[in-house]
């Protein structure tokens, strides 16, 4: 059973979210569960470090994009939000919070501002921003 959920503040159009936890989960209360991942969008604007701390306090991390297929709902995300991607100046790579390197062709990274942190924007775009800029953020938790 699928529920057609239209979350006007989060998505550009209707997205299909499973109704029962037998398909997905468990997730913290009021989080979105989709293809074995739990997501929550936080409206308060924080810098990257504060956003990371907020996610960690909920046993989660900032959004990690690892698969366009498993995370296809991210295509439709409205606006732009902090994700867990940081630039490592020493080797020039982009790295997730868990230390893994951004896979090629997963995100279109565009330099909107001089900075070492990245915002997630719809259709798998990453916007480079100054880490101290306040923005909304997305936390993510992998289900077991």
């Amino acid at each position: 059973i699928w529920s057609a959920v239209f979350l006007n503040s989060l998505f550009n159009q209707e997205v299909q979210i499973p109704l029962t936890e037998s398909y997905c989960g468990p997730c913290p209360k009021n989080w979105i569960c989709y293809k074995n991942n739990c997501y929550q969008f936080f409206d308060e604007s924080k810098n990257w470090y504060e956003s990371q701390a907020s996610c960690m306090s909920q046993n989660a991390s900032l959004l990690k994009v690892y698969s366009k297929e498993d995370q296809d709902l991210l295509k439709l995300v409205k606006s732009y939000h902090w994700m867990g991607l940081v630039h490592i100046p020493t080797n020039g790579s982009w790295q997730w919070e868990d230390g893994s390197i951004l896979s090629p062709n997963l995100l279109t990274i565009i330099e909107m501002q001089k900075g070492d942190c990245a915002l997630y924007a719809s259709s798998f775009k990453g916007y480079i921003e100054n880490c101290s800029t306040p923005n909304t953020y997305i936390c993510m938790q992998r289900t077991v």
Epitope: Y80, T133, P134
Partner: antibody, heavy 115, light 108 residues
């Protein structure tokens, strides 16, 4: 679809400050980055700068010392201020939103710098 | 900054013909972050192509983009009367974002 409308004086005196506002037709001000681009008569396009809804701005270095872009999310507007203008700043000024590129543009407003 | 040079400056063609417009960058444009715009007299530019080869929403398939690195091409497979206009390329791989000087496609 979002619609953009520039407004402001069409004539500015040399050494004064040019001020323009772009009004966004819906509440999408928090969904995109917002840009200003200009085009002198009979010439090409020049990117001035852009701003996020949170106020983080990036400017063209050639104009950085004179330009300020600001945003007012409560009014669904963003603004351009260009100080110490000269005749070389005479141009059509466009506002645009940034998504995959400059996707949607205002119709443009002509600003003449003359005494 | 990256300087974009478009050629030719003017292209004189007849409706139904193929138009090939070139945009050359002074240094490599990272990840093919190049867009093409069409501008008609008295109008704002309109986005045609982004990411060097992706068509923007509502753009007819007679418009196609290609290229990478420093050399990019916009092709109009069969010119329609409404395609006669000025075309600009723009890079967004490196700040400051820059435009080419434009190519005018006029009726022969």
């Amino acid at each position: 679809q979002v619609h953009l409308q520039e407004s402001g004086p069409g004539l500015v005196k040399p050494s004064e400050t040019l001020s323009l506002t772009c009004t966004v037709s819906d509440d999408s001000i928090s969904s995109y980055y917002w840009s200003w681009i200009r085009q002198p008569p009979g010439k090409g396009l020049e990117w001035i700068g852009h701003i996020s809804y949170s106020g983080s701005a990036n400017y063209n270095p050639s104009l950085k010392s004179r330009v300020t872009i600001s945003v007012d999310t409560s009014k669904n507007q963003f603004s351009l201020k260009l100080s110490s203008v000269t005749a070389a700043d005479t141009a059509v000024y466009y506002c645009a939103n940034w998504d995959d590129a400059f996707n949607i543009w205002g119709q443009g407003t002509m600003v003449t710098v003359s005494s | 900054e990256i300087v974009l040079t478009q050629s030719p400056g003017t292209l004189s063609l007849s409706p139904g013909e193929r138009a090939t417009l070139s945009c050359r960058a002074s240094q490599s444009v990272s990840s093919s972050y190049l867009a093409w715009y069409q501008q008609k007299p008295g109008q704002a530019p309109r986005l045609l192509i982004y990411g060097a080869s992706s068509r923007a929403t509502g753009i007819p398939d007679r418009f196609s983009g290609s290229g990478s690195g420093t050399d990019f091409t916009l092709t109009i497979s069969r010119l329609e009367p409404e395609d006669f206009a000025v075309y600009y390329c723009q890079q967004y791989g490196s700040s400051p974002w820059t435009f080419g000087q434009g190519t005018k496609v006029e009726i022969k």
